[in-house]
């Protein structure tokens, strides 16, 4: 029960964590003008990775798509493409999370086959989450040298004429929406891997055990050999000189809740 | 350090046209947009063009069909053409170009339209 309870919300907290990814990855606001310390309050521009928007005074706000891949900034790239694959990883974990739920039963799939997906998915979840989080921070960081570059060059040029004023951009809602949402898939693949441990069926040891009375009722087949169980021929043929129960190895087992006499 | 240089303003007589030039030097990429504002005397900063990377330009409504913004990408300059020029013209025209991480303005250049 604490396993499906366990996998169930593993599986929910994951699906929400995607949702989120792709949210943030679709949003415009990942850099936004710095409203502090502004120098020009008649536009407010905000960025995102398809696109870039300027709200005037007015009110008007115009988005523009970045229709080019050369005059883009490498980075810029290399954070697209951080959250695609977060997304794609994050899809299918759901798609073989989904077939994994212990609470859903496809056909006669065993117990292994469904830990294996479910572990399957976790680290799919989890390589997703990461993926988020990388991407978002890699963005956020770019944005933070490019603040503090900016900071600095607003201080040096208040000696003599400024030639160039800068407006420099903070974090924007998406890095956060990201942030959070690649720790909840992160957390949801950590839940399915840990599910997967108590779906995984224990390692059962079918070894034949023949049992016979000690004493004098000891039964023989012809050509004094011993009668197999059902579990796999005798195929070693070894003659019972003694009382008691023996595998077929000569090692000795004590009965299971595997074996019925 | 990046440096917005704009030049090409003066005096002009109603009817006349002035080009407005803007040059961005120094370490600026992946620009988004570069684009003209306008402040008039004890007024705020509107927005009279923006050249976008890619895509037509927007213009504000009260230059629609008198302006032209043009800009060269490979140079990083942006121009604006201004025919018909009218008293209510007159303002410091501001230059801008907006990244991906930053906003860049221009020290800004006087146009002043005589009637």
């Known amino acids: 029960m604490a396993v499906t309870a366990c996998q169930g919300l593993g599986f929910v907290v994951s699906l929400i964590g995607i949702a989120g990814i792709i949210a943030a990855t679709c949003m415009d606001q990942w850099s936004t003008q710095d409203l502090y310390n502004n120098p020009v309050t008649a536009v407010f521009n905000y960025q995102g990775l398809w696109r870039s928007c300027v709200r005037e005074s007015s009110g008007f706000t115009e988005c523009r798509g970045y229709f080019t891949l050369l005059g883009l900034p490498a980075m810029l790239q290399a954070v697209r493409a951080l959250m695609i694959v977060g997304i794609v990883l994050g899809a299918i974990g759901l798609l073989v999370s989904i077939f994994a739920l212990k609470c859903i039963r496809i056909g006669s799939m065993e117990d292994s086959a469904k830990a294996n997906m479910t572990l399957t998915s976790g680290i799919m979840f989890i390589v997703s989450g990461l993926c988020a989080i990388a991407g978002v921070s890699v963005f956020a960081n770019m944005l933070v040298t490019n603040f503090w570059m900016s900071t600095a060059n607003m201080y040096t040029g208040m000696g003599g004429m400024v030639q160039t004023v800068q407006t420099r951009y903070t974090f924007g809602a998406a890095l956060f929406v990201g942030w959070v949402a690649g720790g909840l898939t992160l957390i949801g693949g950590v839940m399915m891997c840990i599910a997967c441990r108590g779906l995984a069926p224990e390692e059962t040891n079918y070894k034949a055990v023949s049992y016979h009375a000690s004493g004098h009722s000891v039964a023989y087949k012809p050509g004094g050999f011993k009668a197999s169980t059902g579990f796999g021929s005798n195929t070693k043929n070894k003659k019972i000189y003694d009382g008691g129960a023996r595998t077929e190895d000569e090692v000795q087992s004590y009965p299971s809740k595997h074996d019925y006499v | 350090q990046v440096k917005l240089e704009e030049s090409g303003g003066g005096l002009v007589q109603a009817g006349g046209s002035l080009r407005l030039s803007c040059a961005a030097s120094?370490?600026?990429?992946?620009?988004?947009?570069m684009a003209w504002y306008r402040q008039a005397p004890g007024k705020q900063r509107d927005l009279v063009a923006r050249?976008?990377?890619?895509?037509?330009?927007t213009y504000a409504e009260s230059v629609k069909g008198r302006f032209t913004i043009s800009r060269d990408n490979a140079k990083n300059t942006v121009y604006l053409q201004m025919n018909n020029l009218k008293p209510e013209d007159t303002g410091v025209y501001y230059c801008?170009?907006?990244?991906?991480?930053?906003?860049?303005w221009g020290q800004g250049i006087q146009v002043t339209v005589s009637s």
């Open positions: 120094g370490s600026i990429s992946g620009i988004n947009y």
């Open positions: 050249a976008w990377t890619t895509g037509p330009p």
């Open positions: 801008t170009a907006n990244t991906l991480t930053s906003g860049y």
